[in-house]
């Protein structure tokens, strides 16, 4: 009933040895279970951290320390909502050799977006 | 406040049941998960587990798979730790604690820092 | 199964820095965690994403991760940082969590 799941941006290059987090909106559910789908096997993430902008909107973030070349593929978060599971558009996670310069694309469409945080 | 209070310490024969509980206050219950690990007299700490802040999915450690069940009561706020046959080497301090979940900002740590005092469970015949 | 793999033991005079290690062969992958345990209590987090101190810590701890190799660095150890610390970390599939066996640190 009016759920609305995304992720962003759609294609995001990094390179090798990053850290990068992955982020997901789900709004219209309260207190949704995230669950991260990497080329159709789900991820566990026993440590994974969720914003709640309130009580019908959530931010679950993926984080993966170092990205290797295993990592990259094809990620999207689903949520059960009764009985049925929804899942977001997809985001293509790239892997550039470690010291290129990395670009970030996304869709302007997905312009709500802020691109997943990179730590040091 | 964030308080876990766990229940008291129990002594207990071997081949005997138990349901220790881990009861939530100070925060919404829903938005962590809650785990367990297990410290042997005079020993380290080992993780045991965790059920995630639906209490619909729990995830062991291999040591305790099939030995122990974690659950928990979302209504009372209140995780559990069960087992079917206590053997002595269950002997330990089992604390529970508050784990990954909501949080103000994308790695802000409020989980894995707070932790109940522990119960302790002695299996003797 | 997996393990991640800490001296038993470190001692260091007041005021020298002490370093305790963390072996671990998911660690270039997974966040390395680290606890404070003193006599009698439940433990303290300390470090946390390898690096990160938590609310409350002093300055003089601080943490690195490097390869399969995370380290704990206490700057100028006090007689009050003795205690037992352990690190804490994931498998490599994040199917479930580790603990350190343990290093007694003491200060005298």
């Known amino acids: 009933a009016g759920l609305k799941l995304m992720g962003a941006p759609v294609k995001l290059t990094v390179s090798q040895g990053q850290p990068v987090k992955l982020n997901c909106s789900v709004e219209g559910m309260e207190e949704p279970d995230i669950q991260w789908v990497k080329d159709g096997a789900v991820v566990q993430n026993l440590d994974q951290l969720y914003i709640p902008v309130s009580e019908q909107h959530w931010i679950g973030f993926l984080s993966l320390k170092s990205v290797e070349r295993s990592d990259a593929g094809r990620y999207w978060c689903q949520v059960e909502d009764g009985g049925e599971t929804e899942i977001s558009q997809p985001v293509w996670l790239t892997l550039v050799p470690r010291g290129s310069s990395a670009h970030h694309h996304h869709h302007h469409h997905h312009s709500a977006w802020s691109h997943p945080q990179f730590e040091k | 406040e964030v308080q876990l209070v766990q229940s008291g310490a129990d002594v207990k024969k071997p081949g005997a049941s138990l349901t220790i509980s881990c009861q939530a206050s100070g925060y919404t219950f829903t938005d962590y998960w809650i785990s367990w690990v297990r410290q042997k007299p005079g020993k380290g700490l080992e993780w045991m587990g965790q059920i995630n802040r639906h209490a619909s999915n729990t995830m062991y450690g291999p040591s305790f798979q099939g030995h122990v069940t974690i659950s928990a009561d979302r209504s009372t706020a209140t995780a559990y730790l069960q087992w079917r046959s206590l053997e002595a080497s269950d002997t330990a301090m089992y604390y529970c604690?508050?784990?990954?979940?909501?949080?103000?900002?994308?790695?802000?740590?409020?989980?894995?820092?707070?932790w109940g005092p522990g119960t302790l469970v002695t299996v003797s015949s | 199964s997996y393990e991640l793999t800490q001296p038993p033991s470190v001692s260091v005079s007041p005021g020298q820095t002490a370093r305790i290690t963390c072996s671990g062969d998911a660690l270039p992958k997974k966040y390395a965690y680290w606890y404070q345990q003193k006599s009698g209590q439940a433990p303290v987090l300390v470090i946390y994403?390898?690096?990160k101190r938590a609310s409350g810590i002093p300055e003089r701890f601080s943490g690195s991760s490097s390869g399969t190799m995370a380290t704990l660095t206490i700057s100028g150890a006090q007689v009050e940082d003795e205690a037992d610390y352990y690190c804490y970390s994931q498998e490599r599939k994040g199917n479930y969590f580790v603990f350190g066996g343990g290093t007694k640190l003491t200060v005298l």
């Open positions: 604690v508050r784990s990954g979940g909501a949080t103000s900002g994308g790695t802000i740590p409020e989980y894995y820092q707070h």
């Open positions: 994403e390898d690096w």
